[in-house]
């Protein structure tokens, strides 16, 4: 989990900083967003408990030709210690809802700071 | 280039039923992920079913569970919604949509009226 070199730094990051660096970057979609986010594209809900970052990623990176959130892809994909694909859901990844790409980045970002305050940085 | 055109929306009677049509071209139908989509009058964009490629799993919001069904004939490029049991909660404009593509890729939309 500590293995995100290439995002902000030449070197491993430390988990603090990947996390703060995930939530900068989701605040940076949030309040650059004009018009709708990834044109209104919708994605699965997650449950924001264990295994998140995982399912993260696998609701988004369904995702494609949305420059918005592509540095958000990336960076998800450091948290994850396996490789996602497109079409693939995990056993914890329950398909209930969908919802708007700009909302799952708001429901994520504030779990995620959350996470930072309670110093839960993996 | 993707081309969705829904059909079969109309004004029904609480209780009635529908069935809407979306004819699908400008991609590979059988292999793609689709979705329902509905929007409310002066509402935002919400969520109605979900049917994967091979039809082995349909998904479908809490509020339309057990009164509206999902399916696909892949052999005619076809999504269809039926729609029963209507409730004048149900009234939309309702789209099909290849999952995971944004509006600009979505059809016009087909009205649907539940009003006694």
């Known amino acids: 989990l500590t293995c995100l070199g290439g995002f902000a730094s030449p070197g491993p990051v430390p988990p603090s900083t990947a996390l703060r660096e995930l939530i900068e970057e989701l605040v940076n979609i949030t309040q650059n967003q004009k018009a709708p986010l990834c044109n209104g594209s919708m994605v699965w809900s997650i449950n924001l408990t264990a295994g998140m970052y995982c399912a993260a990623l696998e609701s988004l990176i369904n995702v494609s030709g949305c420059s918005a959130i592509e540095k958000t892809q990336r960076m998800l994909s450091g948290f994850c210690p396996h490789k996602v694909s497109a079409g693939q859901f995990s056993s914890l990844h329950v398909r209930d809802t969908k919802i708007e790409v700009a909302q799952f980045v708001k429901d994520l970002l504030l779990h995620l700071k959350k996470l930072f305050r309670e110093g839960q940085f993996n | 280039e993707v081309q969705l055109l829904e059909s079969g929306g109309g004004l029904v009677q609480p209780g009635g039923s529908l069935r809407l049509s979306c004819a699908a071209s400008?991609?590979?139908?059988?292999?793609?992920?689709m979705d329902w989509v509905r929007q409310a009058p002066g509402k935002g964009l919400e969520w109605v079913s979900t049917?994967?490629?091979?039809?082995?799993?349909?998904y479908y919001a809490d509020s339309v569970k057990g009164r509206f069904t999902i399916s696909r004939d892949n052999s005619k490029n076809t999504l269809y919604l039926q729609m029963n049991s209507l409730r004048a909660e149900d009234t939309a404009v309702y789209y099909c949509a290849k999952a995971y593509t944004g509006r600009s890729w979505w059809g016009p939309g087909t009205l649907v009226t539940v009003s006694s």
């Open positions: 400008g991609f590979t139908f059988d292999v793609a992920e």
């Open positions: 049917i994967s490629p091979s039809r082995r799993g349909t």
